[in-house]
């Protein structure tokens, strides 16, 4: 069975949890001191306060903490105030600010570019496999298979627009019905949320930063998973998305519009096209069962081609094989017919690094995957550092207040909806929900944006990406217009339905609580973040895919018991926290289960042992490598050369859940500077405001 976070002998305390309104921080519960727990199941366990049962945060025993880990850190100012500076100091400060802004924009640029190249790398590594997923005939009859194909394909190509466009072309070619396409679109929505989760992994170096960043990223995942969990059965039963979108498409006489404006691509494309250029049509062709496409490379070689349509004479076995009776003749021996042939003449080669290497797609993809992840990680570290040095004191206060404060009463409820609109607008501008949510992740990590505020921004991002799809659909050629518009609208209404489910009533904002719970677990056991990623985005979809291929009977035979066990556990959990007296004594806690089934501790020991052999070698490579090491091996002394792990762990070695108090350093975002990883800046020259 999959590892569970610790489930102790916990009793609820209803008075201790106060749910904050939207945008507010939940009040930290008073946590009583806890005796050191041993792995002995029979040992007495001190009671701790728990959040309500509907929160995943209840699944982790947290020891005494100075502060609520979800409270935003205080970004204190260590520099000299502007008014106290002389003219020279002011000029120097101004240019420092300009310099920082340029650096920040530069790293942001390369961050977005690396996301684009990461997507290309994934397409090179798994694009053809992704295309083959689509050519499975069972998609038509099995919505669950459609869903996991949507997830897997989007994860493999790192782009929901690519998987959606494949679906559109399949629908317009009548290879797929709109009904069968809807679950795939839902899956694509889930798959696209992996990008910012990967970005969150890069912030693994600092526990509290990672806690927030990972929770901020996975709030997107949980929203999508929960929406699918509710809306897929509803759609299968009622076909409401199909019906609504069909009515809209039929009631309007749409004329072909113009392409959605590529605003961010205009800036990033000149750089990314120098690295690699892909022929994305190949994936679509594979999806549409084109045998020739399977041998084609995704790496674009020729960028300028001349296509000439000519008619050529070809021999046919018999007159029955002729194009038409009038286009049939004989030379006395063979039968001939005329066929239209598109002759493509290559004129100019593309200008990118891999154009003349003639490497296999997998090799190019692997190279780009490693490089883009390194650049992504490097840029992220630098963005966090620069933001940390800029967002201090007054600046931080203003930004945090602006972003996280609600409108005055009675309009406080409108704030979240404005955030949804902002998220949608920003995503529309950058033309990618992955880019927007990935940019949001480090900001959540360093404590500029709360998860409560990031949630509506993420929901808005989901809407924004569908409006882009609607615009792209309106620009489709005549034959694809109807199908692409209907699918884009299905995507849109699916996200709207999800928002209506999981946003308007604060009680229903389950994704926030689930993400915080996962953030807590991942901060304690950082390997669990990778485990979560693999399980939710690869293993579960692949298992469902495999079972679906085996047939409905196998899928139901395995699925029903699994779902039954999950429901049973959830019901038991609910009863344990709400009314434990109804349960027999043995079932009032999880102690009846072996430790490995109710705690991650034994699993942690296994993972630590497994990764132990890599510790010494990997850490000395570089800081980036060290971060990867810290992610895998929760080790206090793994880094001998670089101190990035060692120092962070030192103060917390004795604790069960090492979470650094935000006040420990002047500025949490540059705490590593204060710790000696980088020489601390001289406070005299430190510029705090732009």
């Amino acid at each position: 069975m999959a590892p569970w976070p610790e489930l102790g002998d916990a009793q609820p305390n209803p008075d201790k949890y106060l749910e904050g309104a939207a945008g507010q921080q939940p009040t930290a519960p008073d946590k009583s001191k806890e005796t050191n727990k041993t792995d002995n199941t029979e040992a007495p366990v001190t009671k701790i306060e728990l959040l309500p049962s509907y929160s995943t945060a209840t699944l982790i025993d947290e020891p005494t903490e100075v502060d609520d880990p979800w409270n935003l850190p205080t970004l204190q100012d260590s520099g000299i105030k502007w008014s106290e500076r002389d003219t020279k100091g002011k000029i120097l400060c101004f240019f420092q600010g300009i310099g920082r802004l340029i650096l920040l924009l530069g790293f942001l640029y390369f961050f977005v570019c690396s996301l684009d190249i990461l997507s290309s790398a994934f397409q090179l590594v798994g694009g053809k496999m992704a295309g083959q997923f689509f050519s499975n005939s069972s998609i038509m009859s099995n919505p669950l298979l459609g869903l996991v194909i949507g997830v897997l394909v989007t994860v493999l190509v790192q782009s929901s627009s690519t998987s959606t466009s494949i679906v559109v072309s399949m629908v317009s070619s009548s290879l797929l019905t709109v009904r069968a396409a809807i679950p795939i679109i839902m899956g694509a929505n889930i798959g696209t949320s992996i990008t910012n989760t990967i970005v969150a992994l890069m912030q693994v170096g600092d526990r509290s930063e990672f806690r927030r960043a990972f929770a901020g990223a996975t709030v997107h995942d949980f929203f999508n998973w929960l929406s699918v969990l509710v809306l897929l059965p509803v759609e299968v039963a009622t076909h409401y998305l199909e019906i609504i979108t069909q009515l809209i498409v039929e009631s309007f006489h749409f004329k072909n519009g113009e392409d959605a404006p590529d605003l961010l691509k205009v800036i990033t494309k000149p750089f990314t096209k120098l690295i690699v250029q892909l022929d994305k049509k190949v994936i679509s062709q594979i999806a549409m069962n084109d045998e020739k496409a399977k041998n084609k490379s995704l790496v674009k070689i020729w960028c300028k081609t001349f296509t000439n349509k000519t008619q050529i004479n070809v021999t046919v076995p018999s007159t029955a094989n002729c194009t038409s009776p009038s286009l049939c003749w004989t030379d006395g021996i063979q039968n001939w017919t005329m066929k239209n042939v598109t002759y493509k003449e290559n004129i100019a080669k593309c200008q990118h690094i891999f154009v003349n290497f003639h490497l296999p797609d997998l090799a190019v993809g692997t190279i780009l995957l490693i490089l883009s992840l390194l650049v992504l990680c490097g840029c992220l570290i630098m963005i966090v550092k620069i933001l940390g040095s800029v967002l201090k004191g007054q600046v931080a206060t203003v930004i945090k207040k602006t972003i996280n404060t609600d409108f005055p009463f009675p309009f406080a409820w409108l704030t979240g909806y404005l955030a949804i609109l902002v998220g949608a607008g920003m995503t529309f501008i950058v033309q990618s929900s992955s880019v927007f949510t990935s940019a949001l992740t480090p900001l959540i990590g360093i404590g500029v944006i709360t998860i409560e505020r990031a949630y509506p921004l993420t929901l808005g991002s989901n809407i924004g990406t569908t409006t882009t799809a609607i615009l792209a659909a309106l620009a489709s050629p005549g034959n694809a217009l109807r199908s692409s518009l209907q699918i884009a609208l299905c995507h849109f209404f699916f996200n709207i339905s999800g928002i209506l489910l999981w946003y308007p009533i604060p009680f229903t904002r389950l994704p926030i609580r689930m993400a915080k719970g996962l953030g807590n677990i991942s901060a304690k056991y950082r390997w669990f973040a990778v485990f979560y990623l693999i399980i939710f985005f690869f293993l579960i979809p692949l298992t469902v895919f495999g079972l679906s291929l085996a047939g409905w009977r196998v899928l139901v035979g395995v699925g029903v018991p699994v779902v039954f066990i999950i429901i049973l556990v959830l019901c038991l959990r609910l009863l344990q926290s709400r009314c434990p007296r109804v349960l027999p004594k043995k079932l009032q806690n999880w102690n009846f289960l072996p430790l490995w089934m109710r705690s991650l501790k034994p699993w942690d020991a296994v993972v630590s042992k497994f990764t132990g052999c890599f510790q010494m070698r990997c850490c000395c490579c570089c800081r980036v490598c060290c971060r990867a090491c810290c992610l895998l091996c929760d080790c206090p002394k793994c880094c001998r050369c670089s101190k990035c792990c060692e120092d962070l762990e030192e103060a917390q070695e004795g604790q069960d859940v090492p979470v650094k108090a935000p006040e420990t350093f002047d500025n949490i975002t540059i705490s590593r500077e204060a710790q000696g990883e980088v020489p601390a800046s001289d406070s005299k020259t430190e510029c705090t405001a732009l």
């Epitope: 009038s326 286009l327 049939c328 003749w329 004989t330 030379d331 063979q334």
Partner: antibody, heavy 120, light 107 residues
């Protein structure tokens, strides 16, 4: 220039066989299809069949299938047609012809014809 | 087999006259039709193929038209050397078949 030289006139008895030749020059023998056409006096023309000397592939008019045999000798650039089980209605002039207009059955070079008379 | 019916079987016209010979196919042959000229005691000569394409060396007064089942050979201005028998032929299907011929004479 392209030339097709056919063998001389033949007088044969009913039931017998006749083998006529068509010697070519002025072009690559294996390039073009060789057609054989029958023209009976006072009647229309009939296509007997064709052979592609390059591969030896043949095609026949069902009416003549089994009685006509087309062959080609690449070494001498000569095409042959053998007509068996002759009857009086086989009395005609037989032409060999080639089509240099690739992929078409429009023949543009003809031999002078071989006259075959079937009489007892 | 595809039958090619030629009409008229013979015609007489003055020098300079416009002469039209028609050929009707029993089924659609597209444009796979050729026209031949055979002068008495001579071998046939290809005039037109693909319904309207003149063969090398054929005077421009000869033209062809039609498609499907109806085809026409036109001599825009009859000349004394045009006295001959004209045959149409289809090469759309095996066996290749010829029309019965049209004998053209000068009045």
């Amino acid at each position: 220039q392209v030339q097709l030289q056919q063998s001389g006139a033949e007088v044969v008895k009913p039931g017998a066989s006749v083998k006529m030749s068509c010697k070519t020059s002025g072009y690559t023998f294996i390039t073009y299809n060789m057609h054989w056409v029958k023209q009976a006096p006072g009647q229309g023309r009939e296509w007997i069949g064709a052979i592609y000397p390059g591969s030896g592939d043949t095609s026949y008019n069902q009416k003549f299938k089994g009685r006509a045999t087309l062959t080609a000798d690449k070494s001498t650039s000569t095409a042959y047609m053998e007509l068996s089980s002759l009857r009086s209605e086989d009395t005609a002039v037989y032409y060999c012809s080639i089509s240099t207009i690739i992929t078409t059955g429009a023949v543009d070079y003809w031999g002078q014809g071989t006259s075959v008379t079937v009489s007892s | 087999d595809i039958q090619m019916t030629q009409s008229p079987s013979s015609l007489s016209a003055s020098v300079g006259d416009r002469v039209t010979i028609t050929c009707k196919a029993s089924q659609d042959v597209g444009t796979a039709v050729a026209w031949y000229q055979q002068k008495p005691g001579k071998v046939p000569k290809l005039l037109i193929y693909w319904t309207s394409t003149r063969h090398t060396g054929v005077p421009s007064r000869f033209s062809g038209s039609g498609s499907g089942t109806d085809f026409t050979l036109t001599i825009s201005s009859l000349q004394p050397e045009d006295v001959a028998t004209y045959y149409c032929q289809q090469y759309s299907r095996i066996p290749l078949t010829f029309g019965g011929g049209t004998k053209v004479e000068i009045k």
